[in-house]
Interface confidence: low
Amino acid sequence: KLTIESTPFNVAEGKEVLLLVHNLPQHLFGYSWYKGERVDGNRQIIGYVIGTQQATPGPAYSGREIIYPNASLLIQNIIQNDTGFYTLHVIKSDLVNEEATGQFRVYPELPKPSISSNNSKPVEDKDAVAFTCEPETQDATYLWWVNNQSLPVSPRLQLSNGNRTLTLFNVTRNDTASYKCETQNPVSARRSDSVILNVLYGPDAPTISPLNTSYRSGENLNLSCHAASNPPAQYSWFVNGTFQQSTQELFIPNITVNNSGSYTCQAHNSDTGLNRTTVTTITVYAEPPKPFITSNNSNPVEDEDAVALTCEPEIQNTTYLWWVNNQSLPVSPRLQLSNDNRTLTLLSVTRNDVGPYECGIQNELSVDHSDPVILNVLYGPDDPTISPSYTYYRPGVNLSLSCHAASNPPAQYSWLIDGNIQQHTQELFISNITEKNSGLYTCQANNSASGHSRTTVKTITVSAELPKPSISSNNSKPVEDKDAVAFTCEPEAQNTTYLWWVNGQSLPVSPRLQLSNGNRTLTLFNVTRNDARAYVCGIQNSVSANRSDPVTLDVLYGPDTPIISPPDSSYLSGANLNLSCHSASNPSPQYSWRINGIPQQHTQVLFIAKITPNNNGTYACFVSNLATGRNNSIVKSITVSASGTSPGLSA
């Protein structure tokens, strides 16, 4: 069937269109094109005779049409009037006619649109804005874009006038955005430049910063005010209702108590005509004087004197605070505070009470500290210490002894030998000693301030022969897997070698055994029951040697898990039940029995004559070592059968 296809169907003004013929019959005489939907000689555009290849323009020919041998018609420089139907009349060789109609539409190329607005400065929550997309164009579709996105759905947004007008009701500051409109028709689409909506808003309630409302006398007051507003707000400050200045910041240097009061910031928007205010109350506190400490006794004597420290000056309705060693006061019966906390009394001072002490006065903003005060506590002398600790010396060596006693003020020292004053020095030196230098060496320490004296006596033996040593222990009854034991070989002697034996053998290598103090001390870590052996120490020098008597270590252990014997668990009725419980333990444990959870006797052996099936149940033996504080237990089930019913054993 003869058909006409318009390519394109929608044509832009000034462009061209081809009316393409499909299914053209064979054996044609010619054809003719007409404007409209029917053959009308008055509206003939062009005719074409195939035999002569002659094209003849008709009344509707515009000079823009070209006919092709295949009957297609090209129309150039399309104008709006060209819109409509076109009919092809085909005359076949047998003079039978055929017709086909096609059509196309002509649309203008759209100009770039622009946006007009009825209100360039709308006020938030009050005004509406109508944007209109210009120009008005027939057969065009209008679209809107906000921030390059399609229009959001909102009851405040309304499209009208064929979508050409976009109205924003009750604008808000959030409507400040980029708006574009777009015009579309079948042949073109054009987008406008952006229009930025400038919404006037505010001022919102201003905020005053910083937020703090308390200041000290002498500080600077610097307040800043801000309110969201378009255009930016104009600011005014009022103090206690009186206008101060028209600035965003209020600065008052070196404030006093008189600057306390209500501070108001007013924000004004000249375009919206609105004012908003915020009030803050500022309190300025007077600066208190720096406190200081007085003492009723600057040189107290340890364990004798009390000291009263007072925080000055006295101020009514003030909180006083105290610190010792940069920490708040410890709880102690020797520390007493007066009712107003202003006086701190130290009862019976000790050398540890030196301080430093600080007091503080608390005001509304902060705490003012005094300078620290240190007490000069007089103490001592303590018992003097004579070093070195050797008591045995060989003839011919030099004897050099030093004495020290804790004391404030420092002690004065004197040396006596066998009760006779030797010298008033802290050190005693005797060269090239002999057996005659053996004796009692006394150091006397004296505190001139307290008048107290203390002495220490040391026995010095000068001999070529070493004495028989002895073993001292720091723990005579250590607990297994818990305690350590340190054996020390006495005495301490100069230029002496110390040796150890265990059960007559030299020391085994063990990570639990450690020698220290020049081998004079043997430490056993985490003792076990196997460490309960005989320990001997020996001393030797170039001229003699000696061994101590043995010391046996008594290790407390257990109780281990007990064993109940005999092992039988099945008995015949009428037999005697004789159970014995044993647990390894040092010292021996205490035993107790429970049958079916019920306490029985506190013995090692449980005896029940002529048992019956009623004696069935659980038999528990409990062991307890009072020395180690440890307990243990074991449970055994006993079954008693009636005579002849079970192959059980009898006791």
Epitope: V146, S150, P152, V153, S154, T172, D175
Partner: antibody, heavy 121, light 107 residues
Framework: EVQLRQSGPELVRPGASMKISCKAS????????MTWVKQSHGKILEWIGL????????VYNQKFKGKATLTVDKSSSTAYMELLSLTSEDSAIYYC??????????????WGQGTLVTVSA | DIQMTQSPASLSASVGETVTITCGAS??????LNWYQRKQGKSPQVLIY???NLADGTSSRFSGSGSGRQYSLKINSLHPDDVATYYC?????????FGGGTKLEIK
């Protein structure tokens, strides 16, 4: 009552393409944008893109350009998402969601029940 | 793209307790943030839009707050029915990115 009814679960071969439908009822179809969201790995949600039924305009997440094609049929109030050249990475639940807005904040007020897509040989 | 970071990834709380979920954006999103709840096997539903506004049908036990880059969702007086995964979402600019989700369980 607003409803978004999605097409049923799909099992598709790798390399194939498929189309999910989302039929809207109970509101004016052209009044809201239609958004598509992918839920994978149990909980991760990814925004694929949106289409404005009023004029057919689309906005895609760059990650899904070439993977998803969004279309609408206004006459049947139905939105479609075509997924192209599927791989196992595309196995997920896909939701359509109708947008609402206040000022310039959009949110997804109405959601379809989800369509499970499994890509497997 | 704007990145949304949610924390914690999961949390467990007792009935009656108050819980808070936070969400950070990689840039200022000016309050353009929504919160969604997704229960097991169900579609997500909006709880809060525009950072602070309660969506229709959302219980008043839920509240949203925040501005700039930091936002939070607070659930008062926890109910067993609140067990779900919660998501925040940027809606300032496309792509409308979601947070990684917070799975809420009842102790």
């Amino acid at each position: 009552e607003v409803q978004l009814r999605q097409s049923g679960p799909e099992l598709v071969r790798p390399g194939a393409s498929m189309k999910i439908s989302c039929k809207a009822s109970g509101y004016s179809f052209t009044a809201y944008t239609m958004t598509w969201v992918k839920q994978s790995h149990g909980k991760i949600l990814e925004w694929i893109g949106l289409i404005a039924p009023y004029h057919g305009g689309t906005v895609y997440n760059q990650k899904f350009k070439g993977k998803a094609t969004l279309t609408v049929d206004k006459s049947s109030s139905t939105a479609y998402m075509e997924l192209l050249s599927l791989t196992s990475e595309d196995s997920a639940i896909y939701y359509c969601a109708g947008g609402a807005s206040s000022g310039f904040v959009t949110w997804f007020a109405y959601w379809g029940q989800g369509t499970l897509v499994t890509v497997s040989a | 793209d704007i990145q949304m970071t949610q924390s914690p990834a999961s949390l467990s709380a007792s009935v009656g307790e108050t819980v808070t979920i936070t969400c950070g954006a990689s840039e200022n999103i000016y309050g353009a943030l929504n919160w969604y709840q997704r229960k097991q096997g169900k579609s997500p539903q909006v709880l809060i839009y525009g950072a602070t506004n309660l969506a229709d049908g959302t219980s008043s036990r839920f509240s949203g707050s925040g501005s700039g880059r930091q936002y939070s969702l607070k659930i008062n007086s926890l109910h067993p029915d609140d067990v779900a995964t919660y998501y925040c979402q940027n809606v300032l600019s496309t792509p409308y990115t979601f947070g990684g989700g917070t799975k809420l369980e009842i102790k």
